[in-house]
Interface confidence: low
């Protein structure tokens, strides 16, 4: 999916108002310095591409993020504020429902969510028009 035409300011508002808090809740009890940020992004569409990938694509050692509160709110924000996004995700969602069985918070998942926090921070870094 091409995130170029998303309403970035609305997504930013969704992140600041709720998604960020859910990410912090997920990471509660983890030191902020425990994981190094190794994933980055160069512009807002790129950031959303990386955020989508880390949030919804199962990885080795962490297959259980898609049903977390922050993930569901992320999906809702993208569906509302990115034209045509929800249509592209129908097949992926159905496949995910078949695959997902139980919630397991692994160290790998914590690391992945730490990367997500970094990507979201990158997405939300101050714009000049807001200085």
């Amino acid at each position: 999916y091409d995130f170029t035409n998303c309403d970035f300011e609305k997504i930013k508002a969704a992140y600041l108002s709720t998604i960020s808090k859910d990410l912090i809740t997920y990471m509660s009890g983890t030191k902020s310095t425990e994981f190094n940020n190794t994933v980055s992004c160069s512009n807002r569409p790129h950031c959303l591409t990386e955020i989508q990938s880390l949030t919804f694509n199962p990885t080795a050692g962490c297959a259980s993020l898609a049903k977390e509160m922050f993930a569901m709110k992320t999906k809702a924000a993208l569906a509302i504020w990115c034209p045509g996004y929800s249509e592209t995700q129908i097949n992926a969602t159905q496949a995910m429902k078949k695959r997902r069985k139980r919630k397991v918070t692994t160290n790998k998942c914590l690391e992945q969510v730490s990367q997500l926090q970094g990507l979201w921070r990158r997405f939300n870094r101050p714009l000049l028009k807001q200085q």
Partner: antibody, heavy 120, light 107 residues
């Protein structure tokens, strides 16, 4: 008002070392990725390197010509950015600017620059 | 390595429109920024993110970016616009890349 003030420049012999400082004020320094950019006399701008904010791990990246010789650090408690320059070469002669990065990888605030001259 | 190419100099008559180009491979896929630098002074950001203007920069300054060329347009050029102009973009390998600079002369 955002302000960046560099200091520490001067004349140094080839192979020598120098440490530049950049004092920041007027914004939350710790939130920003900070950079050094240089400009040789009569030449264009050249990116030297940057240090990310602590929330983004505080890691550094450098341009190829200075990698292994220059080290960027920051002291968020003092709102200060540093550039440690070792094994200086004559081609490092330039005005060194510190700059604040905003979104899109652009530099919205620059210091006035400090001149480093490497000459025997 | 990624390179940005600018003309060494551009001339414009007072009150006319100046266009400064910045060429790079598929530059349209990157955000491009433009800086104005007057002699003995630090650079000043005049356009960021292809076409966004920082507060305090006149509406006469605008930018565009597509394909292999980004363009800084200065309408109704004034004597005070005389300066060196640099384009800049971020590259995944070379990080932050500047063009060689263009000297704008207002006739």
């Amino acid at each position: 008002e955002v302000q960046l003030v560099e200091s520490g420049g001067g004349l140094v012999k080839p192979g020598g070392s120098l440490r530049l400082s950049c004092a920041a004020s007027g914004f939350t320094f710790s939130d920003y990725w900070m950079h050094w950019v240089r400009q040789a006399p009569g030449k264009g701008l050249e990116w030297v390197g940057h240090i990310k904010s602590k929330t983004d791990a505080g890691t550094t990246d450098y341009a190829a010509p200075v990698k292994g010789r220059f080290t960027i650090s920051r002291d968020d408690s003092k709102n200060t950015l540093y550039l440690q320059m070792n094994s200086l070469k004559t081609e490092d002669t330039a005005v060194y600017y510190c700059a604040r990065e905003i979104y899109y990888y652009a530099f919205d605030s620059w210091g006035q620059g400090t001149l480093v001259t490497v000459s025997s | 390595s990624y390179e940005l190419t600018q003309p060494l100099s551009v001339s414009v008559a007072l009150g006319q429109t100046a266009r400064i180009t910045c060429s790079g491979d598929n530059i349209g896929s990157k955000y491009v920024h433009w800086y104005q630098q007057k002699p003995g002074q630090a650079p000043v950001l005049v356009i960021y993110g292809d076409n966004e203007r920082p507060s305090g920069i006149p509406e006469r300054f605008s930018g565009s970016n597509s394909g292999n060329t980004a363009t800084l347009t200065i309408s109704r050029a004034q004597a005070g616009d005389e300066a060196d102009y640099y384009c800049q973009a971020a590259d995944w390998v070379d990080f932050y890349v500047f063009g060689g600079g263009t000297k704008l002369t207002v006739l």
